[in-house]
């Protein structure tokens, strides 16, 4: 139960009052306001929007609203020297060039400063060579090419379709395979849902539409020039050669009209199986190079983008807590967009704006939350989560001592089918209880709870009658809070039906066609899904900031730890000979998980029984809950990834968007049969089991009685 005790307020100021104040019409109005011009990170337009949000949050009633600026490495196309790709003949003449921009959507023809499609942080270069089609450029795709098909990508330009994994992983894989350039394209198989028209007549990607995006492999570092520290006025910056995560080969994105022209001429090997074929009318031959008649033609990339240190601005709003002002619950989402940001990020920013307005309304009526709530409008998320990471680096000592929870608020929708939640296990019960109290916006579920429609449409694979909640990966601003600092984190949005729509993300992601009209006409005309997401995100923040006992259930961590231990053991047992030879034991890990389970159970019993009127004991129990997530942090970080420090979860080494459990053990086991020194490789597996077992045991002990 939420509580209002000690905050000197009337009973009407509870969760219901906060939720009732949230209005779909306001979210709609805010979305329109935020999407009329581009708000690219580092531009004057985005600075002006930061100041507007600062001003409005002050008007809404927050105690203080400040801009926090940093000077970080960003990347832009050269305005006078555009990026493009050519097919050249044997004389070097360009016989085909890809488009220089996306045809603007209706009503936006005269908008200036639309950045053309580019891969942010691509180095400059004009490589030319034969093309190799590498499917999604996943680790397993390169294994198929190199090991099974014996195709060498060294010195080749590779063309990969977007989807399945983060684009930065694709580029890293191509680099490791020896490619000298990467072309990324959107295949209709992944970005054109059957039976839906392309924009502006529907929500599908037109042939001239292109996905922008950064291609960094930062592994949580933030600004590439100041890893670990804020990019402030007195920062020491690395030289560009020492910068973290920059790609070493030119990369450029194109749409499927242009991709058709490149892929239709491909020769060489046939695709290995149907999973390598998209939906274009091309053979999807792997190459290398073009077929017979065109075998003398090559592909040439022309990339002239520049990396520039540029000022960015976060907006940080504070609503001081009445009882525990030194405990922070953070709601943050980014403000910068690639172009108009109709979905990403402004569908999220508009929801944050309405949540701030609702909290402000309650505050003006005399209410305060028990704990401090911080609201953040992050900059430069699209360039590598830079704004959130720099702010967290600057404030890390405060955050690690005072951070209760972080709720992320990027895009509110990626579909309109059902809820999608990724969070720490500590928040499972909070999410379950909250969604049981909220009304479902779904057709056919009138009068039913959100929990009911969500569970029906997205059931848990393990527990019947419960909804699916996923692991946190990365690719968004919770990363530094969860993966580096160990602050309990969660995110929620409305999503598509993954069963029937197997395309990646939403079709117009990071294109010029991500407009206000896309949302208003096709995704959420009544803004009812936005309102539901506002209720979920806002409701989580309200409970985290206002409940007397933190709404964390440590027993749910015990359950998942057992599941993850079972899974990693099973992976390891696929190598029984080596397990026996090198005496690889999971006994310590299973024993630690058993201890955690028992101690968590006892802690939960004490949590029911203790005297909540004793502020010292209350604070002590709450601190044990708050610091549990922190206990899973290894100060040394994961191998070669020092800013990924959570031992239970990390972004997958093969897909930044996905979460991996026991990532240290998982990575040590990955492709272990190909390692040149098996003894050393299995030694590392044993070391990672030791680290995991120790961490789980240490975390368990933080829940034991203190004396």
């Amino acid at each position: 139960k939420s509580s209002n005790e000690a905050t000197n307020i009337t009973p009407k100021h509870n969760m219901k009052a906060f939720l009732d104040e949230l209005k779909a019409e306001n979210i709609k109005k805010f979305l329109y306001n935020f999407t009329q011009i581009p708000h690219l990170a580092g531009t004057e337009q985005n600075f002006q929007l930061a100041k507007q949000i600062q001003s409005q949050w002050k008007e809404f009633g927050l105690d203080s609203v400040e801009l926090a600026h940093y000077d970080v490495l960003l990347s832009y196309p050269n305005k006078t020297h555009p990026n493009y790709i050519s097919i050249i003949n044997e004389d070097g003449n360009e016989i085909f060039n890809t488009s220089l921009f996306e045809p603007p959507p209706p009503g936006y023809e005269n908008v200036s400063d639309i950045v053309p499609p580019f891969s942010a942080f691509s180095p400059q270069g004009m490589p030319e060579g034969d093309l190799v089609y590498v499917n999604y450029a996943r680790t397993e795709d390169f294994f198929k090419l190199e090991r099974d098909m014996k195709i060498n990508c060294s010195g080749k330009i590779v063309i990969a379709r977007y989807g399945k994994v983060f684009r930065g992983n694709k580029v890293k894989n191509a680099q490791l395979a020896g490619a000298k350039g990467v072309i990324l394209y959107s295949d209709p198989a992944d970005y054109f849902a059957p039976g839906v028209k392309s924009y502006p007549d529907g929500w599908n990607l037109p042939g001239g539409g292109v996905q922008r995006g950064n291609i960094l492999n930062l592994n949580g570092a933030g600004d590439p020039l100041t890893p670990g520290y804020p990019a402030n006025e007195y920062a020491y910056r690395r030289g560009i050669a020492e910068a973290v995560g920059l790609p070493s080969i030119p990369v450029h994105p194109i749409g499927y009209y242009d991709a058709q022209k490149l892929l239709e001429k491909m020769g060489g090997s046939a695709p290995p199986d149907s999973s390598w074929r998209g939906s274009l009318k091309v053979p999807y031959n792997v190459g290398p190079g073009f077929t017979g008649n065109f075998s003398t033609q090559k592909v040439k990339m022309h990339i002239h983008s520049t990396n520039e240190v540029t000022r960015i601005y976060n907006v940080i709003g504070t609503l001081r807590g009445a009882v525990e002002p030194d405990r922070y619950v953070i709601l943050g989402g980014h403000r910068d967009s690639w172009v108009f940001g109709g979905i990403d990020p402004q569908s999220g920013a508009a929801v944050v704006h309405e949540i701030v307005r609702s909290f402000g309304t309650l505050k003006k009526e005399g209410w305060r939350p028990r704990r401090t709530i911080l609201f953040a409008s992050w900059d430069a998320e699209e360039f590598g989560l830079l704004g959130s990471t720099e702010w967290a680096e600057e404030n890390s000592r405060l955050l690690q001592e005072r951070g209760v929870a972080y709720i992320n608020a990027d895009s509110s929708i990626e579909g309109n089918y059902t809820l999608r939640v990724d969070c720490t296990p500590l928040m499972y019960s909070l999410v379950h209880n909250l969604t049981k109290e909220l009304k479902s916006p779904d057709e056919g579920f009138e009068g039913k709870s959100l929990y009911e429609s969500w569970t029906k449409k997205s059931p848990s694979p393990e527990f019947s009658g419960m909804p699916r909640i996923s692991k946190l990966g990365s690719g968004n601003d919770f990363e530094v809070f969860f993966q580096r600092l160990g602050i309990a984190s969660g995110r929620a949005r409305y999503t598509k039906n993954w069963e029937t729509n197997k395309f990646s993300g939403y079709p117009l992601y990071h294109s010029v066609y991500e407009t206000y009209e896309l949302v208003e006409k096709f995704y959420d005309p009544m803004f009812k899904y936005h309102l539901t997401v506002a209720q979920v995100r806002g409701g989580m923040v309200f409970e985290l900031a206002n409940s007397i006992v933190l709404p964390f259930d440590c027993r749910d961590y015990a359950v998942v730890l057992r599941k993850y231990a079972d899974k990693i053991y099973s992976i390891s047992m696929k190598h029984p000979q080596e397990m026996k030879t090198y005496s690889v034991s999971f006994d310590s890990l299973f024993s630690a998980v058993k201890n955690f389970t028992e101690i968590a159970s006892k802690f939960s019993e004490r949590l029911q029984d203790f005297d909540k009127s004793n502020p010292i004991v209350l604070r002590m129990m709450n601190d044990q809950l708050m610091f549990l997530e922190r206990a899973f942090i290894d100060p040394l970080g994961l191998p070669d990834r020092p800013f990924y420090r959570h031992v239970i979860y990390a972004p997958s080494s093969h897909n930044k968007y996905a979460g991996e459990s026991f990532p240290g053990i998982y990575d040590a086991l990955f492709d272990i049969e190909s390692k040149v020194d098996p003894s050393k490789a299995w030694g590392e597996v044993k070391r990672q089991i030791y680290v995991a077992a120790f961490t789980v045991q240490a975390a368990a002990e933080t829940l034991s009685e203190v004396a």
Epitope: E462, R562, K563, A565, D566, K567, Y569, S570, S572, M573, P576, M579, K580, S583, V584, S585, F586, D587, F590, S591, V593, K594
Partner: nanobody, 113 residues
């Protein structure tokens, strides 16, 4: 002391079935994931299947998927392997494994006409 005792092996014709059991003692049975591993005559060890805390979390080698079913009864401290549609190439000594280092002595399964 950890003890794993397999039983249920024997001679069976191709297409036949067998159910292997592994009685466990000396440890908190329900707290551990368990596996079956086999070794065909003159060959190396081959993982067959693993099971987690309950009968929902199971994993199988491609060679046995759809034919073999792993299960456990935590109240009896026993692990099982139901083997159907047996083939000649399933002939092997089958071992029950806890945590990677504790192995049973094995039970021989011979599939022959």
């Amino acid at each position: 002391e950890v003890q794993l005792l397999e039983s249920g092996g024997g001679l069976v014709q191709p297409g036949g079935s067998l159910r292997l059991s592994c009685a466990a003692s000396g440890f908190s049975f329900s707290s551990y994931a368990l596996s079956w591993v086999r070794q065909a005559p003159g060959k190396g060890l081959e993982w067959v299947s693993s099971i987690g805390e309950n009968n929902h979390t199971t994993d199988y080698a491609a060679t046995v998927k759809g034919r073999f079913t792993i299960s456990r009864d935590n109240s009896k401290n026993t692990l099982y392997l139901q083997m159907n549609s047996l083939r000649v190439e399933d002939t092997a000594v089958y071992y029950c494994v806890k945590d990677g280092v504790h192995w049973g002595q094995g039970t021989l399964v011979t599939v022959s006409s």
